[in-house]
C-alpha cells in the first residue's frame, strides 16, 4: 500500500477522491477530509497537514482548499427557513417557510413565494413534495364542497341532513354545503312541489 506523498509520472493519483496531483513536485498528496482544510501544503517529504474548520465555517468534500466556506443563514427575505444548522462538514440546510413554495432553484432552492389560492369549489392537490411546487387546484369530488379562496382549505363532505334528524332544503354544490330544515317547517312557495287536483 503506497501512502502519500508518492511520485506520479502520469499526473494521476490512485484515489482521486482523497488524493490530488501536485505538479510542482510531481507527487500525489492527500486531500483534507470534510470538515477540515489545508493548513500546510505537502512536500516530497511530508504529506498535507489538515486543520478543523473554525466555528461558522465548513468544507463538505475531500479537498485541498486553504480556507473553509463561510456558513450562511437561511434568508427569510427569500422565504427560507432553517431545517438544520451549519456544521463543519455541511452548510446550513434551508427550506421554504410554511405556506410557500420554491419558485427559483439553483443547486438548492434560492427563492420561495406564497402558494396560490385555490378558489371556492376546489382544493390544492396533495403532493409528496410539499413546498417544492405551487398549488395545483382540483375540483372538489362529488359530495364535497369548499367555500373560500385559500391555499390550504380542504374540500369537506356535504352535511347529511338525515344524520341530524333534518331534511334537505337545498342540495349542496361544490361551493356550498347542503341546507337543512326541520321536517315540520313548511317549504317556501317556490319550493313547494305539491299540486292540488
Amino acid at each position: 500500500q503506497v501512502v502519500p506523498p508518492y511520485g506520479s509520472e502520469n499526473q494521476t493519483c490512485r484515489d482521486q477522491e482523497k488524493e490530488y496531483y501536485e505538479p510542482r513536485h510531481r507527487i500525489c498528496c492527500s486531500r483534507c477530509p470534510p470538515g477540515t482544510y489545508v493548513s500546510a501544503k505537502c512536500s516530497r517529504s511530508r504529506d498535507t497537514v489538515c486543520a478543523t474548520c473554525a466555528e461558522n465555517s465548513y468544507n463538505e468534500h475531500w479537498n485541498y482548499l486553504t480556507i473553509c466556506q463561510l456558513c450562511r443563514p437561511c434568508d427569510p427575505v427569500m422565504g427560507l427557513e432553517e431545517i438544520a444548522p451549519c456544521t463543519s462538514k455541511r452548510k446550513t440546510q434551508c427550506r421554504c417557510q410554511p405556506g410557500m413554495f420554491c419558485a427559483a432553484w439553483a443547486l438548492e432552492c434560492t427563492h420561495c413565494e406564497l402558494l396560490s389560492d385555490c378558489p371556492p369549489g376546489t382544493e390544492a392537490e396533495l403532493k409528496d413534495e410539499v413546498g417544492k411546487g405551487n398549488n395545483h387546484c382540483v375540483p372538489c369530488k362529488a359530495g364535497h364542497f369548499q367555500n373560500t379562496s385559500s391555499p390550504s382549505a380542504r374540500c369537506q363532505p356535504h352535511t347529511r341532513c338525515e344524520d341530524q334528524g333534518l331534511v334537505e332544503a337545498a342540495p349542496g354544490t361544490a361551493q356550498s354545503d347542503t341546507t337543512c330544515r326541520n321536517p315540520s317547517e313548511s317549504l317556501p312557495p317556490e319550493m313547494s312541489g305539491t299540486m292540488l287536483m
Epitope: 463538505e60 431545517i83 438544520a84 455541511r90 452548510k91 446550513t92 440546510q93 434551508c94 427550506r95 420554491c102 432553484w105 439553483a106 443547486l107 438548492e108 432552492c109 403532493k127 409528496d128 413534495e129 417544492k132 411546487g133
Partner: nanobody
Amino acid sequence: EVQLVESGGGLVQPGGSLRLSCAASGRTFTNYRMAWFRQAPGKEREAVAAINWNGGGTYYADSVKGRFTISRDNAKNTVYLQMNSLRPEDTAVYYCAADSTGWGSYFDYWGQGTLVTVSS
C-alpha cells in the same frame, strides 16, 4: 440505507456523446432531489446538474448548459445525464448524489462514481 450505482462512463472523442445512469435502490425516492457532481483530476468536486423527482427545479452549471441534460424515470428509480458535445475539460469522475430532504442544500447519499474520459 440508500444505494446509488452509476454506469455509462467511458472513453469518448471530443464532440461525442455519453449517457450516464444512476440507479437508486433501498428506499422510495419520491421526495429526493438528485444531482450529478464531477471531480476532475486536481480539481475540487463541483455540481453539474440537479433535478427534483417531479422533474422540476432543474439546475445546470454554466459550463454544461446547452450540452448536458438531466432527466429521471421514476418507474425505474433512475436518473440520467445526457452529455453531448463533450470536451476534454469534461474529463472527470462523475458522481450521482441524493438529498433526502429534497431541498438540495445537503446531498447525503453518494454513488461510487463513473469515469468519463474525453480524448482523441
